[in-house]
Amino acid sequence: EVEKTACPSGKKAREIDESLIFYKKWELEACVDAALLATQMDRVNAIPFTYEQLDVLKHKLDELYPQGYPESVIQHLGYLFLKMSPEDIRKWNVTSLETLKALLEVNKGHEMSPQVATLIDRFVKGRGQLDKDTLDTLTAFYPGYLCSLSPEELSSVPPSSIWAVRPQDLDTCDPRQLDVLYPKARLAFQNMNGSEYFVKIQSFLGGAPTEDLKALSQQNVSMDLATFMKLRTDAVLPLTVAEVQKLLGPHVEGLKAEERHRPVRDWILRQRQDDLDTLGLGLQGGIPNGYLVLDLSMQEALS
């Protein structure tokens, strides 16, 4: 048997081209110079290498760059990026948004993989904060990206970046995340007029406190029920029937369909039945007439 570790005569690769697809895996390993591969990485994607051949090429790069690939190579990895492990990616220093875009493009249409999550983490940590351009890019590829971050991570998002956020980017956010994002959004949109402001802030209202909801109720915003149902229960409870009526406008009729669900259910329990009756919706479960309501939380605070 021929010892298959040395490159056969005449097979040394002079450039990365289509002829290499007919090289055996061991020939690729023996005949393709790693430095040549690194300088011509952009050609690899145009060549229909098999999955196994790509592994050999990756192995060559790993040997050439044991401390991690330089950005000049990373930017042109293309489909070879799908071969990288999170451990490989942790060795990288990615600073260019163009490099990030190029790699996200490779994974486009698939859900966020551990590799992509690691890449984004490395990139954001390298930048120090989630700037608008980065957020723009990430949410374009992964609408749910923002909601995958912890409240601590979200705290590094500057208010200016909030302009890049679309309503669908917040679909999977929980109240803790919206608590962090809402004040940033309020700051970002503070110079807008009433109706425009409401359109922009609406997606973030799951983090709004009671006083902001009271203020909105004075602006004829006509909040839809879907938005209302996402509000913090503790923020909705202190609202009066009149305030909720003003907040929802014509959508107030939708309360009947949601009377058994939070926060509507809990809000009903806190209202006088007399007041609820003024809505004419047949909402039941309010405080009966003649009962005295003691706000124990206020009493505790005073003592």
Epitope: K4, T5, K24, K25, Y51, E52, D55, V56, H59
Partner: antibody, heavy 122, light 110 residues
Amino acid sequence: QSQLVESGGGLVQPGGSLRLSCAVSGFSLSSYAMGWVRQAPGKGLEYIGYISKIGTTYYASWAKGRFTISKDNSKNTVYLQMNSLRAEDTAVYFCARGSSSGGYLDDGFDPWGQGTLVTVSS
Amino acid sequence: ALQMTQSPSSLSARVGDRVTIKCQASQSISNYLAWYQQKPGKPPKFLIYDASDLASGVPSRFSGSGSGRDFTLTISSLQPEDFATYYCQQVYDSNNVENVFGTGTKVTVL
């Protein structure tokens, strides 16, 4: 003289797991690819997958997720972990070495072990 | 996905006959093809690699040819010990394929 000896076969219930071992001698796992192939009674050869000299693994489409190939170079042993076994997994399981010293499956499998029988039945 | 089709599935022949077995790949695999012989109760025996190169110790009556998609294994003069089942195997792409082996051809005594 290169030798391969499979072990770990036997009777297993549907839904169960089994780990087969392939002890090798006469060559180094860091220089050769190693594969697993099975053969149901009276049927043809069915490729499961292989592990290259550098440890990258490749599987038949039907084996992905349920079957895992690994190796321990220091113990000169290759493993096949089989999960969620079904009656149709009943077969003789062969381990085989990549025939070339290039470390990948480039030329075929040679030599082969004698095989170990796995029966999946309740 | 890359698949291998072998024909015929079985054939009967006499000692001394010339026997030809065909193997077809669903896409071009260059010359990345191996052939095996298997007898009942035994593991397969490696016969040919790179479509036409004889493995060590294999008698010269065995030969292989072909490239691209169509391949042939020929036994020039069948011997008593050659009655067995023969399999082709593509080694072009071994990842995420249904099977790298052909369906097999059983050679029996006429």
